[in-house]
């Protein structure tokens, strides 16, 4: 089952219509928002929560405290979180880390890494 | 190829404010920072700050941010900085530079620079 | 800030010798395992040009005389053999804390 904090963010990124990632803009069936948050990628909403709580982490971006930040940004959490976001962060952490560190939103950051595709059946 | 082109020399008086372009070309203007450096005669180079013309986030260093704003146009693929409030301290040639926002864009540095504007304030 | 120092202020070097410079960093410019130190050639009247970017890597198009080396707080560049046309100012510039921020410059002389 998804965690509320992807619903939330989910939400807020989908009220931001002018920065909002293109898959987001493919209403489903119903139309609703439900629907579309279930229909990104398990990956992408990992990222957009990841990205987002990096940007809470450090006051400004920069290579040395976004650096920083990526060390403990997979601390918080239940253990199965934990091993997704460490997993991601290995994977993607240097090209998060340059998203950001250049003024990336995270949309931006999460759709160019590739994950903004809509998952083929229920999560 | 790729193509930073510079707006001509400026003089102007001690209070007043002056706006240089960056028009650029030959590459994706999107997939870059610019960033803008200065040379004051005869002396090494400070660091301004950025765009990213893609997201409109900018990032000033402290000393200039009162007195400097940094814009940039998509449409027109030009950056531009405005300095206010001029003293003769901002006497100098001020560089526009790309930077890619992601290192597979090309070399993780500012790797093309514009000509320079020569920017000289006297009463 | 990052402060860089770089020495020598200036050197006069033969022509087909070695030109060493060396930048150090008041702290560390490392991340990920990479160094966010590059550096530029500069000659008068011109825009600066870049040369070594992320401490080692050589910029396209530049000859491989140039070579860059170094991590954490020490880099070098070096020029081997020198060239009548290196005679320039070079900078180090560091991209890892904000600001980024300049070395103070060499200017390279040839004997």
């Known amino acids: 089952r998804l965690s509320p904090e992807y619903y939330d963010l989910a939400r807020a990124h989908l009220r931001d219509e002018e920065k909002s990632c293109p898959c987001l803009a493919q209403e489903g069936p119903q139309g609703d928002l439900l629907t579309k948050t279930q229909e990104l990628g398990a990956d992408y909403r990992t990222c957009l929560t990841i990205v987002q709580k990096l940007k809470k982490m450090v006051d400004k971006p920069t290579q040395r405290s976004v650096s920083n930040a990526a060390t403990r940004v997979c601390r918080t959490g239940r253990s199965a979180w934990r091993d997704v976001c460490r997993n991601f962060m290995r994977a993607y952490q240097s090209r998060v880390t340059q998203g950001l560190v250049a003024g990336e939103t995270a949309q931006q950051i999460c759709e160019d890494l590739r994950l903004c595709i809509p998952s083929t059946g229920p999560l | 190829q790729v193509k930073l082109q510079q707006s001509g020399a400026e003089q102007a008086r001690p209070g007043a404010s002056v706006k240089m372009s960056c028009k650029a070309s030959?590459?994706?203007?999107?997939?870059?920072?610019m960033h803008w450096v200065k040379q004051r005669p005869g002396q090494g180079l400070e660091w301004i700050g950025f765009i990213n013309p893609n997201s409109g986030y900018t990032d000033y260093n402290q000393k200039f941010k009162a007195r400097t704003t940094l814009t940039a146009d998509k449409s027109s693929t030009t950056a531009y900085i405005q300095l206010s409030s001029l003293t003769s301290e901002d006497s100098a040639v001020y560089y526009c530079a790309r930077y890619p926002i992601y290192s597979d864009y090309g070399p993780y540095a500012m790797d093309y620079w514009g000509q320079g504007t020569t920017v000289t304030v006297s009463s | 800030d990052i402060e860089l120092t770089q020495s020598p202020a200036s050197l006069a070097v033969s022509l087909g010798q070695r030109a060493t410079i060396s930048c150090r960093a008041s702290?560390?410019?490392?991340?990920?395992?990479?160094?966010?130190m590059h550096w530029y050639q500069q000659k008068p009247g011109q825009p600066p040009k870049l040369l070594i970017y992320r401490a080692s890597n050589l910029e396209s198009g530049i000859p491989a005389r140039f070579s860059g080396s170094g991590s954490g707080t020490d880099f070098t560049l070096n020029i081997h053999p020198v060239e009548e046309e290196d005679a320039a100012t070079y900078y180090c510039q560091q991209s890892h804390g904000d600001p980024y921020t300049f070395g103070g410059g060499t200017k390279l002389e040839l004997k």
């Open positions: 030959g590459y994706t203007f999107t997939k870059y920072t």
């Open positions: 702290e560390s410019v490392d991340s990920y395992g990479d160094s966010f």
